[in-house]
């Protein structure tokens, strides 16, 4: 860490602390060095948010945070002559930013977004309780690969929920998924309080359903081979294979973490396919298979959103009822 003046010497406070918003949810504080700081002091700045969260000691005269502006947020900044956390910083200067004005009961609720198959994002929300039934909503979104804030055009309704979807394709850039999409929903007339959300691109991902390619029997085992949804590598997915037997009326569900096609019975070297062997299946009865997938914690933060079920595929003979 930087050296400098004796730790007991307290520095003057920073000056011209100001705050601004970029994009939709990027809040930036900037400040100037203190006036009359010791000449032998290499300045560092101590900052934390109002609730003593995210303490930081750094030489830069700015700090930013990506935060949904649904609540007031404050930053306190002080100067000191070292990186030592035990050193007492100058008097802390505070600057806050408040959310846009409006009746909190007018703001939309349950604003959430799902990234469908890493190709488009679908957001939905409920109207605020204190709003007119003829309110027209607009959703704005921004992420790093966009130069400016975009307006979502495809507003729809699903029951009581409003929604909007926009294209968002996974970019080959390795850092793309480390970022987030910033979302804001307000009304065209400016009567409701805007609502914000930040959607990390490693969460809320819903894959498309897989596609069953082949079912085959070998002895009393059923071999299932399927194609994974586009845009996903198989090691990033978790699988559920459901097998229904018409004769025994059994309903077996298998949770599959690894679905490699290593067995000689499986078709080899087919890109993006996965395989699973279901043991102890009667070949002379009708067996119906369907599969669904979800992202796993190896590649994504979230592992809660299952895809829809694949189309069913059947194998075997339906016994004639006598």
């Amino acid at each position: 860490g930087g050296g400098g003046a004796a730790p007991t010497e307290t520095q003057p406070p920073v000056t011209n602390l100001s705050v601004s918003v970029e994009n939709l949810c990027t809040v930036i504080w900037t400040w100037n060095p203190p006036e009359g700081a010791s000449s032998n002091c290499s300045l560092w700045y101590f900052s934390h948010f109002g609730d003593k969260q995210d303490k930081k000691i750094a030489p830069e005269t700015r700090r930013s945070i990506e935060v949904p502006l649904n609540e007031r947020i404050c930053l306190q900044v002080g100067s000191q002559c070292s990186t030592n956390e035990s050193e007492k910083p100058s008097i802390l200067v505070e600057k806050c930013i408040s959310p846009p004005e409006g009746d909190p009961e007018s703001a939309v609720t349950e604003l959430q977004c799902i990234w469908h198959n890493l190709s488009y994002m679908k957001c939905s929300w409920l109207p605020g309780r204190n709003t007119s039934p003829d309110t027209n909503y607009t959703l704005y979104y921004w992420h790093r690969s966009l130069e400016k804030i975009h307006q979502c055009e495809n507003i729809f309704r699903e029951g009581q929920y409003f929604g909007c979807s926009f294209d968002l394709t996974k970019v080959k850039d390795s850092s793309f998924e480390q970022h987030s999409v910033q979302i804001m929903v307000k009304d065209n007339a400016g009567k409701i309080k805007p609502s914000f959300n930040i959607v990390p691109l490693t969460s809320r991902v819903k894959p498309d359903p897989p596609h069953i390619k082949n079912l085959s029997f070998h002895n009393d085992d059923l071999y299932v081979q399927w194609e994974n949804p586009q845009n996903f590598i198989s090691r990033c997915l978790f699988y559920e294979v459901e097998v229904n037997n018409s004769q025994t009326e059994t309903h077996n569900v298998f949770y599959v973490q690894e679905a490699k096609c290593e067995n000689p019975e499986f078709e080899r070297n087919v890109e993006n396919t996965s395989c699973f062997m279901v043991p102890g299946v009667l070949p002379d009865t009708l067996n119906t298979v369907r599969i669904r997938v979800k992202t796993n914690k190896l590649c994504y933060e979230d592992d809660k959103l299952w895809s829809n079920w694949s189309q069913e595929m059947s194998i075997g003979k339906k016994r004639n009822s006598t």
Partner: antibody, heavy 118, light 107 residues
Framework: EVQVLESGGGLVQPGGSLRLSCAAS????????MTWVRQAPGKGLEWVST????????YYADSVKGRFTISRDNSKNTVYLQMNSLRAEDTAVYYC???????????WGRGTLVTVSS | EIVLTQSPDFQSVTPKEKVTITCRAS??????LHWYQQKPDQSPKLLIK???QSFSGVPSRFSGSGSGTDFTLTINSLEAEDAAAYYC?????????FGQGTKLEIK
Amino acid sequence: EVQVLESGGGLVQPGGSLRLSCAASGFTFSNYAMTWVRQAPGKGLEWVSTISGRGYSIYYADSVKGRFTISRDNSKNTVYLQMNSLRAEDTAVYYCAKEEGHWYFDVWGRGTLVTVSS
Amino acid sequence: EIVLTQSPDFQSVTPKEKVTITCRASQSIGSSLHWYQQKPDQSPKLLIKYASQSFSGVPSRFSGSGSGTDFTLTINSLEAEDAAAYYCMSSLGLPYTFGQGTKLEIK
């Protein structure tokens, strides 16, 4: 056909508990809030509790707050009302209703009678 | 909490008459008012949504009007099957509140 059907009512002693169920059919259940409304014998309608379609937003009337719990299971198309610390004044027919639009009740069940008496 | 006051509490009417029920809100609620009909020993049924929009399947003799604080439910040419209690309900904010009800009796 859109339908809701309540069950679980009955006679219970003061301080006791009861769990009402409401089974829904004929619509995409998770897209709609569900509400419980009650009607004491010979009296008017009183809103009790509402749960949003995905279950994230839950609201209660002051008269039942802390005693009643609303929940839903979207995989079973069912909404529940767990009623604890029941009082004589909770005696009523409890109706389950589907919410629509901006916020009105377009489908009501037949109701289930809850009687709190010693 | 929004308080809704209906008038009259009770009305005895002959068939083919025109009936008017009013509902007054303690503060402005825009068009967030809905009307329900409850026949004896039945559950309530939606008649009018958003103050003036008829709900599907409701006979055309039922109509609603008003906005802000004063609302009216009108039944043109009353029929015997209209004997029921009628309730207005506010859905602006929570709690949802109902009027005390108007009981309509057919002479």
